[in-house]
Amino acid sequence: QLPPGKPEIFKCRSPNKETFTCWWRPGTDGGLPTNYSLTYHREGETLMHECPDYITGGPNSCHFGKQYTSMWRTYIMMVNATNQMGSSFSDELYVDVTYIVQPDPPLELAVEVKQPEDRKPYLWIKWSPPTLIDLKTGWFTLLYEIRLKPEKAAEWEIHFAGQQTEFKILSLHPGQKYLVQVRCKPDHGYWSAWSPATFIQIPSDFTMNDEQKLISEEDLGGEQKLISEEDLHHHHHH
């Protein structure tokens, strides 16, 4: 029977700069029941506080609700592990909420085959930003990435959509079922998880005759890029 091993705070994330959660990994338990507590103070303060919510984020977590989250202050936190034989402390972690934002994935992903009479057919993809993020305040700029592939393909084709919430893709294999997903990231922060896959059957008469494929960030002022088939494979397959 031993004192507990050193815990480690390994991740802090905020969905929207208004709340955040940190998670720790326990060290060895020393063969005894072990209690964990997270304490923190804000930079420039000496008063220590205990984690306000150990429940919301699941096991080995601390959740900071709105009233405990300040954007303009750095949090200095550590985890204390205690059993009957003694205690151990994690290293201190410095957390600035601005830089730990990981949004929820975008919503309402819609995929449609468009076959205008006067133009080439294309796949039209659109989505909505995650609900927790208020883009109107200007606090956030979200960037988007789309990935798609034929159902049985192992490789995804990835397209960067910038700040657009719509995208057109012309180079597709007719007669295949495609999976499409989208994710987002703030200018400072982490990519969201990919959204659940949406799928669409590409009609067998979806034809591309030109060896050049037009990929457009929608005709809403988005810059159109003319990309050759060769460039497409080099730049968009990950």
């Epitope: 994935p105 919503l107 309402e108 992903l109 049985k152 079922k177 959204s195 896959a197 949406t198």
Partner: antibody, heavy 114, light 107 residues
Framework: QVQLVQSGAEVQKPGASVKVSCKVS????????IHWVRQAPGKGLEWMGN????????IHAQKFQGRVTMTGDTSTDTAYMELSSLRSEDTAVYYC???????WGQGTLVTVSS | EIVMTQSPATLSVSPGERATLSCRAS??????LAWYQQKPGQAPRLLLY???TRATGIPARFSGSGSGTEFTLTISSLQSEDFALYYC?????????FGGGTKVEIK
Amino acid sequence: QVQLVQSGAEVQKPGASVKVSCKVSGYTLTALSIHWVRQAPGKGLEWMGNFDPGDGETIHAQKFQGRVTMTGDTSTDTAYMELSSLRSEDTAVYYCVGVTFDYWGQGTLVTVSS
Amino acid sequence: EIVMTQSPATLSVSPGERATLSCRASQSVASNLAWYQQKPGQAPRLLLYGASTRATGIPARFSGSGSGTEFTLTISSLQSEDFALYYCQHYNNWPLTFGGGTKVEIK
């Protein structure tokens, strides 16, 4: 023809863990993100989580936080779902499901009983 | 999480008649909705995805409509093999959730 074949029925005691396997054929696991869904006797369907073998990412329902682990072995095209700290309410048929929902495993009955 | 509500819980219909099943989402799921059929002792079977696209091998008597929060599954002329449980499920965002199911029984 795509097939998902699951491991056999299990009986476990409360507090134990169970690991259900799902062998993919007619497809490579790297191409197939896997959902796990369960159904308690006489009840409806409940989504547990998703495992993407391509990047190893997992997403799960909040109620399973800290109890469910989804993994995959691309060399054998097999996905796994492990549920720990079992309780009687976890007695259910567990299904693995292909990403487009049209391929389902046959189901694995897990019974939790002392 | 999005709550999916199916109605009615049980629908009694005579063979050859039309059956209309409803599914409501607590917030918009666009067209990211699937319908399943499940028979006793079997895994569910995908009927429709994208709210209205029939899955491979599904007969034309099954059709779906709706987008946003209100969805309908219609079976135009019920065959004996259609008496089963039906579930809707959204895949708009995480977590995915299912409706509670509608049992279609012989009248």
